[in-house]
Amino acid sequence: RGVFRRDAHKSEVAHRFKDLGEENFKALVLIAFAQYLQQCPFEDHVKLVNEVTEFAKTCVADESAENCDKSLHTLFGDKLCTVATLRETYGEMADCCAKQEPERNECFLQHKDDNPNLPRLVRPEVDVMCTAFHDNEETFLKKYLYEIARRHPYFYAPELLFFAKRYKAAFTECCQAADKAACLLPKLDELRDEGKASSAKQRLKCASLQKFGERAFKAWAVARLSQRFPKAEFAEVSKLVTDLTKVHTECCHGDLLECADDRADLAKYICENQDSISSKLKECCEKPLLEKSHCIAEVENDEMPADLPSLAADFVESKDVCKNYAEAKDVFLGMFLYEYARRHPDYSVVLLLRLAKTYETTLEKCCAAADPHECYAKVFDEFKPLVEEPQNLIKQNCELFEQLGEYKFQNALLVRYTKKVPQVSTPTLVEVSRNLGKVGSKCCKHPEAKRMPCAEDYLSVVLNQLCVLHEKTPVSDRVTKCCTESLVNRRPCFSALEVDETYVPKEFNAETFTFHADICTLSEKERQIKKQTALVELVKHKPKATKEQLKAVMDDFAAFVEKCCKADDKETCFAEEGKKLVAASQAALGL
C-alpha cells in the first residue's frame, strides 16, 4: 500500500517539472549535475541546467514533442555527455558516455568522489557576501547549491533545498541588520555544522543501500521508525518503510527529481494519517513543505503505548516459533524487530539490528535441531552481552570525555585509532577521530535512556566516513574487513581492534614537525587540527609510545606554539625553537 502508485506519464520530465515547479526543478537538476560532474565550473552547470529547463518547458507544453518521452537518465546523461572537457577533466569517467542506460548512469554513480580535490570553501567578508547576495540573489543561492553538492555528492537533495532556504533567510535578515556579522556568522556556522552532519547521515543511508542492499536499509528503517512511532501498527510502519526506502533509493541513485517528488508525497501521507502514526507530528505538519519534511525526519520519539505484553510469549516460549518463522520469515522477523524496537527507544538502531540478527541466526540453527524449542528457549539470554557491550563502552568513554574535555578526548581517540590502523592517511585519521570525539559533547549530556541511541548511531555515521574515504584508496586490510563484513558490527569491529603489531613505523621526517608563524593567525579549530596532525604523525613514527610520553611531547609542543606566537620575531622563534623541540621529542620518544 505504498503512496507512489502513479499513472504512467507520457513525458517524465514534464511530469516532474509540473509536480515540483520551476524553481525546485532547476535547483534539483543543478544539484544532480554538480554531484555527478564535481569539477565543472559553476557557469557550465548553469548553462546545462537552463538548457534542460527550456527543454522541460517544451514538454510541458506538448508531452508528445520530440524526445519528451525519454527517461530522465537518458536526458540528463545525454546532457552531461555534451561537456567538451569531459576526458581532460574526469579521465576514465568519460568512458561512461559510450554506454547505454541504465549502465551509463551506474557508471556515473561509481565515479562520484567522496573526497574531491577541491579547494576549501573560504568564507568572504560579510559585506562582500551581502553585496553579492543583493546584486544577484538567484546566482548567489545557486552557487551555494553548487558548492555544497559538488563537495557532498550524496547530499540528500530535497534536504539541500531546505538548507538553501535557510541560507537565503539568513542573508535576507542579516544583511539588513545593524551588526551584519554578529547576525550572520553564527547562522552560517550552524548551517555548516548541520550540513556536514546531514551529509554524513545521508552517506550512511546510501552506503547501506549500495553496499548491503535494500533488505539492510529496510531493517534499519523498521527499527528506527518503530522507535519513533511506537504507537503505529506494524502495517503502518511497513508501509512507511517501503516508501522511505523508495525515496532514499532514488536519491542515492541520482534520481533527484523523483526523490524530491516522492518525499513530498510521503510527508503529505504522514500528515494526513498522523492519528495512526504519532502524536508528535502536529507541529511539523503545520509547516511549509521543505520545513515539514525536515521536521518529520527529526521528530522526537512518541510515547510508548500502554499495555505492551512481554515479547517472550510469541518469540521464545511458543512451541510454534519455527512454524511461524518457516512459513512467514520476513513478516515474522520484521514483526520481531518492530516489537523489540518500539519497546526500546533506549537502544541504538544498530544494537536492535544485532539482536534481530542474533535471533534470526538462532532460529536458523534451532529450527533444524532435534528439539527446536529447547534450543531457542534461552535466545533472549544471548542478548544480554550484546546490550551490555555498548552500554559499558559508552559509560567508560563518557567518563573519559568528562575528565578530559573535547579536545583532549579527541586526542585520546586519535592515538587509539592511529595505533589500530596506522596505514590510514593522516588527514583521514584526524578528520574521523575529531568527529568520533564529538560524540562526547553530543551525547554524554543526555540521560542514560538517550545515550546509547545518540552515541552508537552517531558513531555508525562517523565510521562510515572512514569506510567511504578508505574505499577510495584502500591501505588497510583491517579497515576493509571492519567496513565490509557487517554494517551493524562496524563499531564493535573497530572497538575490538588492538594495536597493529604488523605495522612498520614510519621513517622520521623533520619536515613533518616543522612549523611556521602562520600557525599563529589560524583559528583555534585550525590550530587544533595542526597539533592533532602532528600527534598522528608522532604515533605513526612511534606506535609503541606510551600515553605519558605522547602527553609530554604534546604539552611541549603547545608551549612551543604559545611561546613563539608571543615572540617579536615569530619566524625565527619557530625555526630555532622548533629544532630544539624536534630534538627533545626524539629523545623523549627514543627515536
Partner: antibody, heavy 120, light 108 residues
C-alpha cells in the same frame, strides 16, 4: 474509532454451513493475530482459532476440520467458515484482536459478538 | 494443550470485601496469564496481562500474581460495579490459547 464488528450469525439447520465476518475499523487487520472465540449460553469462553500476521491459521483441537479462518486484508475483514454445524455449536461468536502479529493473547479488543443458533 | 482450572466457580461477597480468585494451569505457562471481567450481554474486558500487569484504565484495586502453574486475581476492596464473571486465559506456550471456565461473583 478502533473497533470490531461481527456479522453473519443467524439460525441454521444442523449439518448446514455459515460464514461469519469480522470487520475491523481504525486499524489494519494484517498487523495482528485475529481470533475467534465463542460462548454458549451460560457457559465458558471457548477459543476456536486464529489467523496470524503471517497468514497462518491455528485451531483448537476440537475445531480442526469443520472450522476455517481466513482474511481479506483489502476489505480489512476476517472470516470464520463453519461447516457441518451441530446443536452444540449454538453460541455467541466473538472476534478478538491479539496483542501482536503472532500473539495468542491477551485480547484487549473484542467485538460485541454475533449469535449463531443451530436447530431444526 | 494445557488446561486451566479456575476456582471457585462462584463466589458471593459484599461491597468493601477483599476477594481472591485462583487459576491453576496443568503445566507451566511462565507468566503468560490474563484475567478478564465479563458482564451479561457484553464481551470480556481485559484486566490483567502477563500475570501481574494492570491494563491501562483498570482500577488499581485489581491485582494479579503468580507464575508457572498457580495464579491469583485479587480485588482489594469490592465495588458495586465489580459483580460479574471473571475468566483467566493462558497463552504463549504455543499458537493456541485456553480459557478457564469462569468465576461468577455475586452480591452476598
Amino acid at each position: 474509532e478502533v473497533q470490531l464488528v461481527e456479522s453473519g450469525g443467524g439460525r441454521v439447520q444442523p449439518g448446514g454451513s455459515l460464514r461469519l465476518s469480522c470487520a475491523a475499523s481504525g486499524f489494519s487487520l494484517s498487523s495482528y493475530a485475529m481470533n475467534w472465540v465463542r460462548q454458549a449460553p451460560g457457559k465458558c469462553l471457548e477459543w476456536i482459532g486464529h489467523i496470524n500476521a503471517g497468514d497462518i491459521a491455528y485451531y483448537a483441537t476440537w475445531a480442526k476440520g469443520r472450522f476455517t479462518i481466513s482474511r481479506d486484508n483489502s476489505k480489512n475483514t476476517v472470516y470464520l467458515q463453519m461447516n457441518s454445524l451441530r446443536a452444540e455449536d449454538t453460541a455467541t461468536y466473538f472476534c478478538a484482536r491479539g496483542a501482536g502479529g503472532f500473539s495468542t493473547g491477551p485480547f484487549k479488543l473484542w467485538g460485541q459478538g454475533t449469535q449463531v443458533t443451530v436447530s431444526s | 494443550a494445557f488446561e486451566l482450572t479456575q476456582s471457585p466457580s462462584s463466589l458471593s461477597a459484599s461491597v468493601g470485601d477483599r476477594v481472591t480468585i485462583t487459576c491453576q494451569a496443568s503445566e507451566s505457562i511462565n507468566s503468560r496469564l490474563a484475567w478478564y471481567q465479563q458482564k451479561p450481554g457484553q464481551p470480556p474486558k481485559l484486566l490483567i496481562y502477563d500475570a501481574s500487569d494492570l491494563t491501562s484504565g483498570v482500577p488499581s484495586r485489581f491485582s494479579g500474581s503468580g507464575s508457572g502453574t498457580d495464579f491469583t486475581l485479587t480485588i482489594s476492596c469490592l465495588q458495586p460495579e465489580d459483580f460479574a464473571t471473571y475468566y483467566c486465559q493462558g497463552y504463549g506456550g504455543s499458537s493456541t490459547t485456553t480459557f478457564g471456565c469462569g468465576t461468577k461473583l455475586t452480591v452476598l
